[in-house]
Amino acid sequence: MNGRVDYLVTEEEINLTRGPSGLGFNIVGGTDQQYVSNDSGIYVSRIKENGAAALDGRLQEGDKILSVNGQDLKNLLHQDAVDLFRNAGYAVSLRVQHRLQVQNGPIGHRGEGDPSG
């Protein structure tokens, strides 16, 4: 029997210093470009090799970015989100949501604390 796939969601504050070639990542999402169904959030789609984000090591492809320098990214058009990053200055604080896939045991073998239903 196959195991059930669940997700462990954690949040982290990541402080990046803009490098010579910028922050070094790509984003998808926005109210006009939903990447996840019914979610207009902003997601990291590419970490560029040797860029600031890659060298820092904490930001991951697939992370959802919740805020930039304290400014919420909810309900933004895609280009407005891009512009926010581009104008964020030298020191950039990102609040991000990591979504880690975890494989549970076979279905029917519920562990302690595993919600039923």
Epitope: G22, L23, N26, Q33, S45, I47, E61, V82, R86
Partner: nanobody
Framework: QVQLVESGGGLVQAGGSLRLSCAAS????????MGWFRQRPGKERDVVAT????????YYLDSVKGRFTISRDNAKNTVFLQMNSLKPEDTAVYYC??????????????????????WGQGTQVTVS
Amino acid sequence: QVQLVESGGGLVQAGGSLRLSCAASGRPFSSLDMGWFRQRPGKERDVVATINWTGDSTYYLDSVKGRFTISRDNAKNTVFLQMNSLKPEDTAVYYCAARGGGSSVDSEYDVGEFEYDDWGQGTQVTVS
């Protein structure tokens, strides 16, 4: 990292057709820009065709325009290269490539148009 496996290459006569496939795994396919490149004997690797993550923007090498078509099937995590009216000069190893799509948060001029992060092993196409 994205794992890419190409298939569909082979030997074909001039004027014939082939359809290359590239199956991707390792991360969500729907956020990936995909490309087909080729390396002809004794030459450098060249871009043949690309398709962006949303599927609404494609690029073709001038010499294949009107003959080759790139497409993607997000449900099957696969990108295709339909090659028609093949010519002997299309003989090459064809490589599939992937990168995260979307917009760079850096300068809009930070294009790196044909800069891809992950590569397949290649499939040989020979046109006689």
